[in-house]
Amino acid sequence: RGVFRRDAHKSEVAHRFKDLGEENFKALVLIAFAQYLQQCPFEDHVKLVNEVTEFAKTCVADESAENCDKSLHTLFGDKLCTVATLRETYGEMADCCAKQEPERNECFLQHKDDNPNLPRLVRPEVDVMCTAFHDNEETFLKKYLYEIARRHPYFYAPELLFFAKRYKAAFTECCQAADKAACLLPKLDELRDEGKASSAKQRLKCASLQKFGERAFKAWAVARLSQRFPKAEFAEVSKLVTDLTKVHTECCHGDLLECADDRADLAKYICENQDSISSKLKECCEKPLLEKSHCIAEVENDEMPADLPSLAADFVESKDVCKNYAEAKDVFLGMFLYEYARRHPDYSVVLLLRLAKTYETTLEKCCAAADPHECYAKVFDEFKPLVEEPQNLIKQNCELFEQLGEYKFQNALLVRYTKKVPQVSTPTLVEVSRNLGKVGSKCCKHPEAKRMPCAEDYLSVVLNQLCVLHEKTPVSDRVTKCCTESLVNRRPCFSALEVDETYVPKEFNAETFTFHADICTLSEKERQIKKQTALVELVKHKPKATKEQLKAVMDDFAAFVEKCCKADDKETCFAEEGKKLVAASQAALGL
């Protein structure tokens, strides 16, 4: 029942061109190139894509033509290595071009930058955008793919095609509307927020595969798909997991044409076998390809089958527990994970994986003991504290969120995390803590049964952002330890960190706390970021400051900004009142 066609193809590039069609082929090659060479100008990428596309067409016409038998990595790598300014723009990445495949592609992958030095995307006026869209729709949409791909080098390529389709639809509709801005801006905001979330979720999948291996990803997939498709039998879930792992391995490895092709095949298979997978797929399967794949990926959990028997009989009481474990370790653990996950849509995937790890560790120890059954008889009792820990943490943090609201909840987390890992850069601490704080509005509104999967799995995605940003410039052994020891225990590891007593407070620098009139024209979000940046810097200067001290200083700061933004001579106000504020803050914090 293998989904993926593995017939021998004389020309891989011709095969993918025919499968995907010219439009998708060009879009995916552009994404691939922009994700590898993140600094190259748009026009250069378009030129390279056009050259590759013309070449692919010659191979479609005659698969035996010169170079048509080369692998996609060879073809694309050769093309990237023709870029004239490679050494000047990318430095040591140019050394990749001296390598042979597959080492060359691995080298390019290692140079992907999660935080490229690129200007923030500024949204032009609506009329300017609509004119550009009407003048050259194709270029406008390619520019969108290019700008997103170069800023998000691990963005899930077939999903980016779906975002581009929605982006196009928004402009097609809204540029004809009476009030273009009212129509377009909310749609663009939604696409931006969904896009950031999609990018972060995919980044975790790639980190899981690349840092912890295929087994870790497969375990995650077994748990998630078993929650989503609890009526599907284990053999079906295993098959889907194998295929999904292949799709994500390809995308994370830069094999975007294969990835998109295989994802389409997987969606087709799922829809052809809905009856044995899930009753929730009907609507998804009526949609066109890109919408269908997206819909399947987001589909709600099916209802659990009635009267599922106790797990203890097969996994604790059976005489064959150790035989099963010895004969087929990973399959047996996979069955355990499947059976546990399908019964617990109320648990986070990471919790389910912790339970499976505990079960595995217990069997590893007990199956070598004199009386294995006596040894593992109470294994399920070991699960209780593991389940209660995230439950209690979520309860406490949702109470705090409801009490404070999002902005102040973010501030509480900013203080908490700056004290844990003060060596981390201020922009990273602000970005990560703001995202951690969004868990409140995202998840605390849910009933108890949905809170944990929402919250803890979201936190895994956000903490992975911290891990990949920190990996680029490591500054904290504690971050490295939490990020690398165990994928599923990252969140508990960070939660358990106390104030870093070894940290030497940062020298006070008045410049850090000097503000200007430009703050008054910023959006509410940007103004919050400015204040939160100041808060992190305060904590770095005075890590032992109490909540009350920090609150007093922040309240004074908010009043100062409000006062000066209302003043006639704003700049003078910021200069004079700013000095007073810095002096008062130093006194309040004993700096």
Epitope: D320, N324, E327
Partner: nanobody, 123 residues
Amino acid sequence: EVQLVESGGGLVKPGGSLRLSCAASGRPVSNYAAAWFRQAPGKEREFVSAINWQKTATYADSVKGRFTISRDNAKNSLYLQMNSLRAEDTAVYYCAAVFRVVAPKTQYDYDYWGQGTLVTVSS
């Protein structure tokens, strides 16, 4: 607890075909290994065929190419399609199940058994 009930046995001429069924109740057995054993009068019970969770089948040499084991997990049922039957296939056929990842071939490995169905091959 798993209960197993076989059906489909009977009298058939040499060269004929029969399809045995085994219905499981008590709990779903899609992840269980399931097997058919047989016992001819005055002989030991012997392994015929087994199938695992992945629907991978194994057969005794004496039935290879003639018998096909299958399962329908939606119906919680196991089947044995017997073609080209011979007089030496005459026996009581038993269905068995156990929660094992790798399907065993020894009767002592199986936890659950049906009461058996008689197959007689005679002209």
